[in-house]
């Protein structure tokens, strides 16, 4: 990805998804009525013209926001502590890797706008999730809906990372 982002970063992302899956506490079928459109900014992860700075920034902000969301008293009360600790550790490792990368990308002179713009958009998205949890009084179903929403958005963000990685491989082999 144009910096020494360890090869296991993709593996860590997949582990995060696995952990989020394992964290399930109730049947999602009980929560159909609680579905909500959080308006995940799909255009941010779906583009074909991927810039390193943009990808790094999206992934960093996503992981930072997930870390914050699952690092609260409310979250500790809702989830299995062992799995939650593993999630915190994995997210922390990924954030450290990405911060190293972001510093290098900025050093290479990539646009600051490519970094700040996705961060603002994602903060608004996560704020909507926090408002929803509060509205729903942090119910089990609200957390379940949020867990599945985070899995979806993280999956899409990880896909974007993989697309950039394969684009870099193609350029390297040509």
């Amino acid at each position: 990805l144009g910096c020494d982002l360890p090869q296991n970063h993709g593996l860590l992302s997949r582990n995060t998804l696995v952990l989020l899956h394992q964290m399930r506490r109730i049947s999602p079928f009980l929560c159909l009525k609680d579905r909500r459109d959080f308006r995940f900014p799909q255009e941010m992860v779906k583009g074909s013209q991927l810039q390193k700075a943009h990808v790094m920034s999206v992934l960093h902000e996503m992981l930072q926001q997930i870390f914050s969301l699952f690092h609260t008293e409310r979250s500790s009360a809702a989830w299995n502590m062992t799995l939650l600790d593993q999630l915190h550790t994995g997210l922390h490792q990924q954030l450290q890797h990405l911060e190293t990368c972001l510093l290098q990308v900025v050093g290479e002179g990539e646009s600051a706008g490519a970094i700040s713009s996705p961060a603002l958009t994602l903060r608004r998205y996560f704020q909507g999730i926090r408002v929803y949890l509060k509205e729903k009084k942090y119910s089990d179903c609200a957390w379940e809906v949020v867990r599945m929403e985070i899995m979806k958005s993280l999956f899409l963000s990880t896909n974007m990372q993989e697309r950039l990685r394969s684009k870099d491989r193609d350029l390297g082999s040509s």
């Epitope: 159909l32 579905r35 929403e149």
Partner: antibody, heavy 121, light 108 residues
Framework: EVQLVQSGAEVKKPGESLKISCKGS????????IGWVRQMPGKGLEWMGI????????AYSPSFQGQVTISADKSISTAYLQWSSLKASDTAMYYC??????????????WGQGTLVTVSS | DIQMTQSPSSLSASVGDRVTITCRAS???????LNWYQQKPGKAPKLLIY???SLQSGVPSRFSGSGSGTDFTLTISSLQPEDFATYYC?????????FGQGTKVEIK
């Protein structure tokens, strides 16, 4: 390209068992639920039940609870609908369709081509 | 269960006509999770509109959806020859998921 491909038409006798399949491709199979819908000849659509292939959790319509069994094998991205003892009234077209689970996205955005089940003595 | 009632059950219209189909739920669909499907003979249903008013990708803009709570509408602004089919509404708000009985749009 997202696809749901169903098994072929079946002709069975009353009392026989049957298992039809729906194979998903072109997307993450465990990220979506699979629903089953019945359409009797010349009639409308009836939702039968649904499965979360990630852990095989199921939910059924009260009209079909105990009449059919929905299962899935995520290793081969396939969902199943089965009967232990068919009746003539089970004659219908059966569709599988993809559902986004608790995520906010279109319900049943992709459908299988349908499996025609004919039960006759 | 939430009962979905469509009206009319069938209608005859000409190419170019504006067609409106209504769907009434027996109780409020609070998050507007109401979908519309088109089905042609011998084919699987096809999603047209989701969340009451969002047009599914690839569906022509002559199709539109509106409504909230218990009353929803599918409108075809200018009927085309390929639009002659049966249309179903479906609520995705609560179990069991339920469909309307269908509205058959025929050529006048």
């Amino acid at each position: 390209e997202v696809q749901l491909v169903q098994s072929g038409a079946e002709v069975k006798k009353p009392g026989e068992s049957l298992k039809i399949s729906c194979k998903g491709s072109g997307y993450s199979f465990t990220s979506y639920w699979i629903g089953w819908v019945r359409q009797m000849p010349g009639k409308g659509l009836e939702w039968m039940g649904i499965i979360d292939p990630s852990d095989s959790d199921t939910a059924y319509s009260p009209s079909f609870q105990g009449q059919v069994t929905i299962s899935a094998d995520k290793s081969i991205s396939t969902a199943y609908l089965q009967w232990s003892s068919l009746k003539a009234s089970d004659t219908a077209m059966y569709y599988c369709a993809r559902h986004p689970g608790l995520n906010w996205a279109p319900d049943f955005d992709y459908w299988g081509q349908g499996t025609l089940v004919t039960v006759s003595s | 269960d939430i009962q979905m009632t469509q009206s009319p059950s069938s209608l005859s219209a000409s190419v170019g006509d504006r067609v409106t189909i209504t769907c009434r739920a027996s109780q409020s669909i609070d998050n507007n999770n109401l979908n519309w499907y088109q089905q042609k003979p011998g084919k699987a249903p096809k999603l047209l509109i989701y969340a009451a008013s969002s047009l599914q990708s690839g569906v022509p803009s002559r199709f539109s959806g509106s409504g909230s709570g218990t009353d929803f509408t599918l409108t075809i602004s200018s009927l085309q020859p390929e639009d002659f089919a049966t249309y179903y509404c479906q609520q995705g708000y609560d179990w069991p998921l339920t469909f309307g009985q269908g509205t058959k749009v025929e050529i006048k």
